[in-house]
C-alpha cells in the first residue's frame, strides 16, 4: 500500500509566441482545479478508460479575474498535494492523465459551469520511495509544471511497497536473518510471510504463503518474465522456461474486483470496471465524496457524505458518465421527426424541419391550405406537407396568379397550329390530321381513325380542346 503524490507548480502560457487568452475575465471570473488519473503499466488507453490505479481531484484554486489587456500569467493554483492512494503493490510503470479544469463563477444558470482547459498525459517509470520527479508538459499553448512521487505507507517498504517493516523488538539489532529497513534504520524487515522463494523484486503477497506477481512476471515464484510470443494454448504452455503464462485459473476467476466491480481479462492481467464512487486496481478505494466536487459540467452530487459511501452525479441535459464528464450525443436519440435534422447547439437542441412541418420536433404536419387561397378559381391541394394549387384553365404558378400560355408547351401534334382561347386552347390541324391535339391521321379514303367527326365539325376543322 502507498500513496502517489502530485504537486502542481505552475499552469500558464508556454514559451514562445501565441500566448493563450486568459481563461478568466472581469465579466467571468473563474478558478482552476486539477484532476489526476493513474493507470498501471505503460497503457495507451483513451482518457475515458478507468483510472485503475486511482484518481484524485484537487481543491479549487483562488478566484482569478483577468486584468484587461494583460497577457495570461501563471494562474493561481489550489493549495496542497493531489494524493492517490493505492492498496496493492506499486506497479513501477504507470500512465497518468492530468486535467486542468476551469470553474466559471459568473451568473451561471444552475450553478457554476466547468470546462476542460487542458489535458496532458504521459507514461513513466517510477520506483516507490524515490525522490520527487519533476516534469513539464504542454497542451497547446498552455504549460503545466509539476512533480510527483510514490511513497509507501508503513509498514510497507521497497520500490513496489511489497516488503513489510516492523518496529524493532530489541534495541540493538534485528532478529536472525532480518535486515534493518533502510532508510528507517530503527525498524526491521518483518518475518517473511510470502511463499518461500517468492521473488522480492517481482512478487508480493497479501496472505501468508502466497506469491503474487507484478505485471510482466509469471511463474510460481514470479521469476519468469512474461513473453507473449510462442504461447500455444489460450493462456500459454505450461513450461515455465518459455516465459508464457501458465495455464490454469484465469485472472478473473473468483472476481478479484471488490464493491460490485466487473472484471475483464487483459493480455497480461485483468481490469476492473468500478461502480460510481470506487476506484483502484480492484475497486477497493472509495475516497471521493461530494465534498470533493466530483461531478463535472454542473452535475448535482448526491450521497457520498463519507468516504465509505458512494456518491451519485445527477447530470444536466447533454452530459453523462459517472462524473458527468462525457458529452451526450443528444441527437443520437433521433428526436426530430418527418425528416427534420437535429442540431445540438450546446445550450439547446433544435430540429430543423423540412418544408410543410413544424413544431419543436417537426411533429406537426402543416395544413398549408389553411388561410392560403389559390387565385383565379384555383383549388388548394395538400400533399406530403407541401401546398399546391390546382389552377383553372389559363392560369398557373404557385398561387395561380400567373396567366398561363396554354400554347407554350406546343400541344398540337403533326404541325398543328395552336391558338389561345378563353377556355383553353384550340388546335388548327394540318391537312390529313384531326383530333383535339391533331393526334389522329385522317385515312386516305376520307375515313378517320375516329368513329366519326362530331356533328358540325369536318375533319381538318380547328378542334377546341376543352
Amino acid at each position: 500500500a502507498g500513496v502517489f503524490e502530485l504537486q502542481i507548480h505552475s499552469f500558464g502560457p508556454g514559451p514562445g509566441p501565441g500566448a493563450p487568452r486568459s481563461p478568466c475575465s472581469a465579466r467571468l471570473p473563474c478558478r482552476l482545479f486539477f484532476r489526476v488519473c493513474l493507470k498501471p503499466g505503460l497503457s495507451e488507453e483513451a482518457a475515458e478508460s478507468p483510472c485503475a490505479l486511482g484518481a484524485a481531484l484537487s481543491a479549487r484554486g483562488p478566484v482569478y479575474t483577468e486584468q484587461p489587456g494583460a497577457p495570461a500569467p501563471d494562474l493561481p493554483l489550489p493549495d496542497g498535494l493531489l494524493q492517490v492512494p493505492f492498496r496493492d503493490a506499486w506497479p513501477g510503470t504507470f500512465s497518468f492523465i492530468i486535467e486542468t479544469w476551469r470553474e466559471e463563477l459568473g451568473d451561471q444558470i444552475g450553478g457554476p459551469a466547468w470546462s476542460l482547459l487542458a489535458r496532458v498525459a504521459g507514461r513513466r517509470r517510477l520506483a516507490a520511495g524515490g525522490p520527487w520527479a519533476r516534469d513539464i508538459q504542454r497542451a497547446g499553448a498552455w504549460e503545466l509544471r509539476f512533480s510527483y512521487r510514490a511513497r509507501c505507507e508503513p509498514p510497507a517498504v521497497g520500490t513496489a511497497c511489497t516488503r513489510l517493516c516492523r518496529p524493532r523488538s530489541a534495541p540493538s539489532r534485528c532478529g536472525p536473518g532480518l535486515r534493518p529497513c533502510a532508510p528507517l534504520e530503527d525498524e526491521c524487515e518483518a518475518p517473511l510471510v510470502c511463499r518461500a522463494g517468492c521473488s522480492p523484486e517481482h512478487g508480493f503477497c497479501e496472505q501468508p504463503g502466497e506469491c503474487r506477481c507484478l505485471e510482466g512476471w509469471t511463474g510460481p515464484l514470479c521469476t519468469v518474465p512474461v513473453s507473449t510470443s510462442s504461447c500455444l494454448s489460450p493462456r500459454g504452455p505450461s513450461s515455465a522456461t518459455t516465459g508464457c503464462l501458465v495455464p490454469g485459473p484465469g485472472p478473473c476467476d473468483g472476481n478479484p474486483c471488490a464493491n460490485g466491480g466487473s472484471c475483464s481479462e487483459t493480455p497480461r492481467s485483468f481490469e476492473c470496471t468500478c461502480p460510481r464512487g470506487f476506484y483502484g486496481l480492484r475497486c477497493e478505494v472509495s475516497g471521493v465524496t461530494c465534498a470533493d466536487g466530483p461531478c463535472f459540467n454542473g452535475g448535482l452530487c448526491v450521497g457520498g457524505a463519507d468516504p465509505d459511501s458512494a456518491y451519485i452525479c445527477h447530470c444536466p441535459p447533454g452530459f453523462q458518465g459517472s462524473n458527468c464528464e462525457k458529452r451526450v450525443d443528444r441527437c443520437s436519440l433521433q428526436p426530430c421527426r418527418n425528416g427534420g435534422l437535429c442540431l445540438d447547439l450546446g445550450h439547446a437542441l433544435r430540429c430543423r424541419c423540412r418544408a410543410g412541418f413544424a413544431g419543436p420536433r417537426c411533429e406537426h404536419d402543416l395544413d398549408d391550405c389553411a388561410g392560403r387561397a389559390c387565385a383565379n378559381g384555383g383549388t388548394c391541394v395538400e400533399g406530403g406537407g407541401a401546398h399546391r394549387c390546382s389552377c383553372a384553365l389559363g392560369f398557373g404558378g404557385r398561387d395561380c396568379r400567373e396567366r398561363a400560355d396554354p400554347c407554350a408547351a406546343r400541344p398540337c401534334a403533326h404541325g398543328g397550329r395552336c391558338y389561345a382561347h378563353f377556355s383553353g386552347l384550340v388546335c388548327a390541324c394540318a391537312p390529313g390530321y384531326m383530333g383535339a391535339r391533331c393526334e389522329f391521321p385522317v385515312h386516305p379514303d376520307g375515313a378517320s381513325a375516329l368513329p366519326a367527326a362530331p356533328p358540325g365539325l369536318r375533319p381538318g376543322d380547328p378542334q377546341r380542346y376543352l
Epitope: D329, C331, S332, L343, L345, R352, R354
Partner: antibody
Framework: QVQLQQSGPGLVKPSQTLSLTCAIS??????????WNWIRQSPSRGLEWLGR?????????DYAVSVKSRITINPDTSKNQFSLQLNSVTPEDTAVYHC??????????????WGQGTMVTVSS | QSVLTQPPSASGTPGQRVTISCSGS????????VSWYQQFPGTAPKLLIY???QRPSGVPDRFSGSKSGTSASLAISGLQSEDEADYYC???????????FGTGTKVTVLT
C-alpha cells in the same frame, strides 16, 4: 476510419448528363445519423453545395435552387454508395466535384469527411 | 455567387494571431451554426470548426471560432507556416433552403 471514394468521367459533352458515384467505406449510406452531400468548386463560383440525401426512417433529399430542375442524388444501399446526376450540362458546370459526409451527431451541416474530388470538364 | 462574405486575404508572421471574418445575414449565420474549413491547393477542404466554436478531434487548439449576430470569425493563434491555406466559412441558409459557403480567405504566413 471512414473514407469516400469518388468515381466517374472527367469529361462530359454539353447537354449530356454528368454522373458521379461516391463509394462509402467505414460507414453506412443508410445510417440514420449522417447526411450525404455533393459539393462543387470552381474559380468562378467558389464552393457551391449542390444537394444531399439522407435516411431518417425513409429517404429524403434536398437540392440547391440553382440546380434543382436538373439534379438527382440517389442512394444505393446494396453497394453502400450514393450518386450524383446532373442533366443538361453546360460549360458553366465545369468544376471539381466533391462528395462529403455530414457525420457529426448534432451538426449535420458540418462536412467532416470528404471524397478526393473529381475534376469534371464540360466541353465538346 | 457566394452568400457569405470573407476578406480575400489575411497574413501574419509566425506566432502572431490572425482573425478571419465571415459576414452573413439573419437567414444563415444569424439563425444557424457556422462551420469553418481549411483547404490546401489540390486537396479537398478539411473541417476545422463546427457549431460555431467546436473543434473536431485532431484539430489544434490554435484554431478557435466564434459567432455574434450575423457574423462569425475564425482565429488562428500562434500562426505557423503550415497554416498557409485557404479558409472558408459555411452555414445553412433558411431562405435558400441550402448550404452556403463564404468567398474564401487566403492566409499567408510572412517569413
Amino acid at each position: 476510419q471512414v473514407q469516400l471514394q469518388q468515381s466517374g468521367p472527367g469529361l462530359v459533352k454539353p447537354s449530356q448528363t454528368l454522373s458521379l458515384t461516391c463509394a462509402i467505406s467505414g460507414d453506412s449510406v443508410s445510417s440514420n445519423s449522417v447526411v450525404w452531400n455533393w459539393i462543387r468548386q470552381s474559380p468562378s463560383r467558389g464552393l457551391e453545395w449542390l444537394g444531399r440525401t439522407y435516411y431518417r426512417s425513409k429517404w429524403y433529399d434536398d437540392y440547391a435552387v440553382s440546380v434543382k430542375s436538373r439534379i438527382t442524388i440517389n442512394p444505393d444501399t446494396s453497394k453502400n454508395q450514393f450518386s450524383l446526376q446532373l442533366n443538361s450540362v453546360t460549360p458553366e458546370d465545369t468544376a471539381v466535384y466533391h462528395c462529403a459526409r455530414g457525420g457529426i451527431v448534432g451538426a449535420p451541416d458540418a462536412f467532416d469527411i470528404w471524397g478526393q474530388g473529381t475534376m469534371v470538364t464540360v466541353s465538346s | 455567387q457566394s452568400v457569405l462574405t470573407q476578406p480575400p486575404s489575411a497574413s501574419g508572421t509566425p506566432g502572431q494571431r490572425v482573425t478571419i471574418s465571415c459576414s452573413g445575414s439573419s437567414s444563415n449565420i444569424g439563425s444557424d451554426p457556422v462551420s469553418w474549413y481549411q483547404q490546401f491547393p489540390g486537396t479537398a477542404p478539411k473541417l476545422l470548426i463546427y457549431t460555431n466554436n467546436q473543434r473536431p478531434s485532431g484539430v489544434p487548439d490554435r484554431f478557435s471560432g466564434s459567432k455574434s449576430g450575423t457574423s462569425a470569425s475564425l482565429a488562428i493563434s500562434g500562426l505557423q507556416s503550415e497554416d498557409e491555406a485557404d479558409y472558408y466559412c459555411a452555414a445553412w441558409d433558411d431562405s435558400l433552403n441550402g448550404h452556403v459557403f463564404g468567398t474564401g480567405t487566403k492566409v499567408t504566413v510572412l517569413t
